[in-house]
């Protein structure tokens, strides 16, 4: 049993890190795979996660850590029964993927606009709270080629367009997601896409 | 606003026991890890002990460890430091310190005021 | 562990100068470096956070840079309320650790 792609690993800054890799062939990841994990310092614990398949070779392990901080930085030891296949390290506050946003939510009662809101996925006492800032997609239902990014580099999670900038009568859908200034993280997931109907019609003498 | 205030030092000789507590306010308290760090007469900062927010990881200082034990209780908003088998070098100032942020553990944004620990015969 | 080495470990200057203290780390720490300032019989007080990062309501004459394994604290015009020691502390891997102390003075 050979390990192909190795271990790559992202941590949320919060308690959970996630690895990925691929094995030299088909694998029953939950069966066959342990990723042993402990803090590097003195004599920690040593933790356990039990892969899942991600695909025909590719398994996926996430790691549930007690509250990270920047000083953590944990040995990662991959085995298959008796045989270690592989081993490294993972310092959670250098390979940072925030979490995704929530709750975006389209607001169209206000005239001529349209409002977006979402949820910042920390608490105010996460480094990462004043430091997110967020890329929104809104497409087209019918036209993937009408696609749009907004990028929102404010600290607010709100996105005001005028409803005039969208097509009239048109379905629309919007997603959004998140990365962290200071630590040059990767960006999140995206959220939940979310529809709306832009029923906003040009005052009659701009027609 | 952020109150720490630590108490439960004094006189011991050397092979004694004491218990600190540090009794905190204004915060979530159980959001937070939390460190001692000392000072001893006239010398610099030495970190002793942190304990993370929800209590599964402790970690110490070289100079202490198997003689000091960090806990807290979240219920109660308070740290607790267990001092054995005491020695001379341990005497000094022992601050509860609060970081910024949860996931900042050493930027210590909220210090207590200090109590003294003396270690002598 | 890392250690941090402070320098000067004490200096002399007069009111309005430019102070600078230095910290070198024996191994990169990135910027996972702090600052703070301590008066006799006090506690100490956080003045920088993630080597450059001014906290909250102090003052900003105060600054902090560097990077990697050298790091400096600059007060930009010595007031009589700076004259304490200052000490930096790495919390970029355990244990934490910190400078032996800078103690400022009056020339």
């Known amino acids: 049993m050979k390990v192909l792609q190795e271990p790559t690993c992202v941590s949320d800054y919060m308690s959970i890190s996630t690895c990925e890799w691929k094995m030299g062939g088909p694998t029953n990841c939950s069966a066959e795979l342990r990723l042993l994990y402990q803090l590097v310092f003195q004599s920690s614990e040593t933790h356990t996660c039990v892969p899942e398949n991600n695909g025909g070779v590719g398994c996926v392990c996430h790691l549930l850590m007690d509250d990270v901080v920047s000083m953590d930085n944990y040995t990662l030891d991959l085995w298959a029964g008796q045989q270690l296949l592989w081993k490294g390290s993972f310092k959670p506050s250098e390979h940072v993927k925030p979490r995704a946003p929530g709750n975006l939510t389209v607001h169209t009662n206000v005239s001529d606009t349209v409002l977006l809101t979402w949820s910042n996925p920390y608490p105010p006492d996460n480094y990462l709270y004043n430091d997110l800032t967020y890329a929104v997609n809104i497409w087209n239902e019918n036209d993937l080629a009408d696609s749009r990014i907004h990028n929102v580099t404010y600290l607010k999670p709100t996105l005001r367009i005028p409803a005039s900038t969208l097509k009239s009568g048109i379905s629309y859908r919007a997603r959004v997601r998140a990365w962290a200034q200071h630590y040059n993280t990767t960006w999140s997931e995206w959220s939940p896409s979310t529809k709306w109907y832009n029923s906003y019609r040009e005052p009659f003498e701009q027609r | 606003q952020v109150q720490l205030q630590e108490s439960g030092g004094g006189l011991v000789q050397p092979g004694g026991s004491l218990r600190l507590s540090c009794a905190a306010s204004?915060?979530?308290?159980?959001?937070?890890?939390l460190t001692w760090v000392r000072q001893a007469p006239g010398k610099g900062l030495e970190w002793v002990s942190t304990?993370?927010?929800?209590?599964?990881?402790?970690l110490y200082a070289d100079s202490v460890k198997d003689r000091f034990t960090i806990s807290r209780d979240n219920a109660k908003n308070t740290l607790y430091l267990l001092m054995n088998s005491l020695k001379p070098e341990d005497t000094a100032v022992y601050y509860c310190?609060?970081?910024?942020?949860?996931?900042?553990?050493?930027?210590?944004?909220?210090w207590g005021q200090g109590t003294t620990v003396t270690v002598s015969s | 562990d890392i250690q941090m080495t402070q320098s000067p470990s004490s200096l002399s200057a007069s009111l309005g100068d430019r102070v600078t203290i230095t910290c070198q780390a024996s191994?990169?720490?990135?910027?996972?470096l702090a600052w703070y300032q301590q008066k006799p019989g006090q506690a100490p007080k956080l003045l920088i956070y993630?080597?450059?990062r001014l906290q909250t309501g102090v003052p900003s004459r105060f600054s902090g840079s560097g990077s990697g394994t050298s790091f400096t604290l600059t007060i930009s015009g010595l007031e009589t309320e700076d004259l304490a020691t200052y000490y930096c502390?790495?919390?970029?891997?355990?244990?934490?650790?910190f400078g032996q102390g800078t103690k400022v003075e009056l020339k």
């Open positions: 310190a609060k970081p910024l942020y949860n996931n900042f553990a050493g930027d210590f944004g909220s």
């Open positions: 204004g915060f979530t308290f159980s959001s937070y890890s």
């Open positions: 304990i993370k927010a929800r209590g599964g990881t402790t």
């Open positions: 191994q990169s720490i990135s910027s996972y």
């Open positions: 993630g080597g450059s």
């Open positions: 502390l790495q919390d970029y891997s355990w244990p934490l650790t």
